[in-house]
């Protein structure tokens, strides 16, 4: 989030009265962790357990058909990008019980942090690609068959990759660390000092590209898709249509606070009391975003499931079926091979 | 009453060394920072570190590393600040100054300055 | 380091009359608890400065109250209603937010 956003623990509200208890010697730091840092240690905990973990499976079990399937092409970008979130989750999770304390320096400051940001960016261009694939497979099944590859694929994820790493630069070239002088605290954050015009810009650019755009964009390319499948009557439509409504569903829902928080502060006094409530809601938010990055491999193992029956096969070999089974092109039958990797766009939820 | 107790002016030797000491009263010496300052004519204040008397942890300003040693006494209530390699620049007044914060953090400023001490180096 | 520009460098005024001094910060000294160390000095020639205003605009026990402080973010202002004999000197804006602490470069308080 923008503007120097990590709170310290409190230190009692400063009243003006003159009064020191002499014999009393004072503590320079607090012991009690306010409840939504205690709530965000608890999700950073299992989203770096269960996403490294997960995304390690998907990389594992993609990376082998990577070159001859192209749903494997989309599932392992998108699993690299979580997996590369969940990497800095451990120096996130210090920092937090640390009382917000940023012990790790000036690179790691504006590195770290960005990478939800990097990976919101990666996973919305990349769940678009994916849609964009999606689209065509229903509307432009001859196109596909001339045109669509592997080699195709890989560029238009370069592509992605590249513009989420021009996006995520404002974040990473404002962070800074900054020490409080008292209470003695070193914290990362990021400054923009006088030009609260910038803060805001940045704040609406990734409101509108990392959100607002996205969700337009694909209510709209899912809604064309699914009122085509219902007119040809494809089957498992109404199981396409459940993965979809998933993984869109909770790329928006897991990003929905941070980005409302992140544009209410850019326009908020940073003295002002709604700026500091948000402000110690802040790491809750980031760690809510941060459950994009485990909840992937979940979802896949829920659809998996689904298409199985129940589980009979082993995880690698479950996961193998969802994501690495190639679409065929011709429409009537782009969902019922595929159904799954409409699950793809899930992945967009980072 | 809080009163903070300077050593006297100083007339030292470039390349010497000098170690200007405060004397704290009137409060518990180990429940307050010490704080010094420089003070050149035309150059305004300056922040040069702090001591914390209870356990000795020091924070310096990057621009005197090296140049200051901060130390503190808690059997004398004293604090001591040590200039090393001495040069013209280092000709001013260095004053200590308590920095205050109450229990449960109540208050926070520096609230009382020494009277000031004259160090000049010539040959 | 936090720069602090304090204006007018020298401020001539007549006794009775009303003076305001201004200081601005490079960056937000903001604190992340939402405190904003920012203090005022009086130094008098030959005197060690005096605190008059702590946390922008609380008085120091025993400064009259025709001292004020105000401000935030990176904009304050110490005003003094009327000014006295007692009063001139060089008063200096201080952050105490941030490490380094730094001060602002002073201003004389004049007779005209």
């Known amino acids: 989030m923008d503007s120097f956003n990590y709170t310290t623990p409190d230190y009692g509200h400063y009243d003006d009265k003159d009064t020191l208890d002499l014999n009393t010697p004072v503590d320079k730091t607090s012991n009690t962790l306010r409840v939504p840092d205690i709530l965000a240690l608890v999700i950073f905990a299992v989203v770096f357990l269960v996403g490294v973990l997960g995304n390690a499976l998907v990389v594992w079990v993609t990376a082998f058909e990577a070159k001859r399937t192209i749903n494997a092409i989309w599932f392992l970008n998108l699993a690299v990008a979580d997996f590369l979130s969940c990497l800095a989750l451990p120096i996130l999770f210090t920092s937090i019980v640390q009382h917000h304390h940023w012990p790790f320096g000036g690179a790691a400051c504006s590195i770290l942090p960005s990478l939800i940001l990097l990976n919101m960016y990666a996973s919305i261009l990349l769940l678009a690609t994916i849609s964009a694939d999606r689209f065509l497979l229903v509307f432009k099944p001859i196109w596909c068959q001339n045109f669509r590859g592997a080699g195709l694929a890989w560029i238009a994820c370069a592509v992605a990759w590249g513009l989420a790493l021009l996006l995520t630069i404002p974040s990473f070239l404002y962070r800074v660390v900054r020490e409080e002088y008292f209470p003695p605290k070193v914290l990362c954050g990021v400054d923009y000092s006088h030009d609260k015009r910038r803060e805001r810009a940045v704040a609406i650019v990734r409101l509108v590209l990392g959100f607002l755009w996205p969700l337009l964009t694909l209510t709209i390319c899912y809604t064309f898709i699914l009122l085509r499948t219902w007119s040809r009557r494809a089957t498992r439509s109404t199981k396409t249509l459940k993965v979809v409504v998933a993984v869109v569903a909770s790329f928006f829902i897991f990003w929905l606070p941070y980005q409302v928080t992140g544009i209410m502060m850019s326009f908020l006094e940073p003295s002002s009391p709604t700026f500091l409530l948000l402000k110690k809601l802040d790491s809750l938010c980031v760690s809510f975003a941060y459950i994009n990055c485990c909840i992937n491999p979940i979802i896949y193992v829920v659809a998996g499931q689904g298409f199985q029956g129940r589980l009979r096969k082993s995880l690698p070999s479950l996961l193998r079926n969802v994501l690495t089974e190639e679409s065929v092109v011709r429409e009537s039958k782009s969902f019922t091979r595929s159904t799954v990797d409409t699950m793809a766009q899930k992945t967009q939820a980072v | 009453q809080v009163q903070l107790q300077q050593s006297g002016p100083e007339l030292v030797k470039p390349g010497a060394s000098v170690k200007i000491s405060c004397k704290a009263s009137g409060y518990v010496f180990s429940n307050s920072w010490m704080n010094w300052v420089k003070q050149r004519p035309g150059k305004g204040l300056e922040w040069i570190g702090r001591i914390d008397p209870g356990d000795g942890d020091t924070k310096y300003n990057g621009k005197f590393k090296g140049k200051a040693t901060l130390t503190a006494d808690k059997s004398s209530s004293t604090a001591y600040m040590q200039l090393s390699s001495l040069t013209s620049e280092d000709s001013a007044v260095y004053f200590c100054?308590?920095?205050?914060?109450?229990?449960?953090?109540?208050?926070?400023?520096?609230?009382?300055w020494g009277q000031g001490t004259t160090l000049t180096v010539s040959s | 380091d936090v720069l602090m520009t304090q204006t007018p460098l020298s401020l001539p005024v007549s006794l009775g009359d009303q003076a305001s001094i201004s200081c601005r910060s490079s960056q937000s000294i903001v604190q992340s608890n939402g405190n904003t160390y920012l203090e005022w000095y009086l130094q008098k020639p030959g005197q060690s400065p005096k605190l008059l205003i702590y946390?922008?605009?609380n008085r120091f026990s025993g400064v009259p109250d025709r001292f004020s402080g105000s401000g935030s973010g990176t904009d304050f202002t110490l005003k003094i209603s009327r000014v006295e004999a007692e009063d001139l000197g060089v008063y200096y804006c201080f952050q105490g937010s941030l490490v380094p602490p730094t001060f602002g470069g002073g201003t004389k308080l004049e007779i005209k």
């Open positions: 946390k922008v605009s």
């Open positions: 100054v308590r920095f205050y914060y109450g229990s449960n953090y109540v208050g926070y400023y520096f609230d009382y």
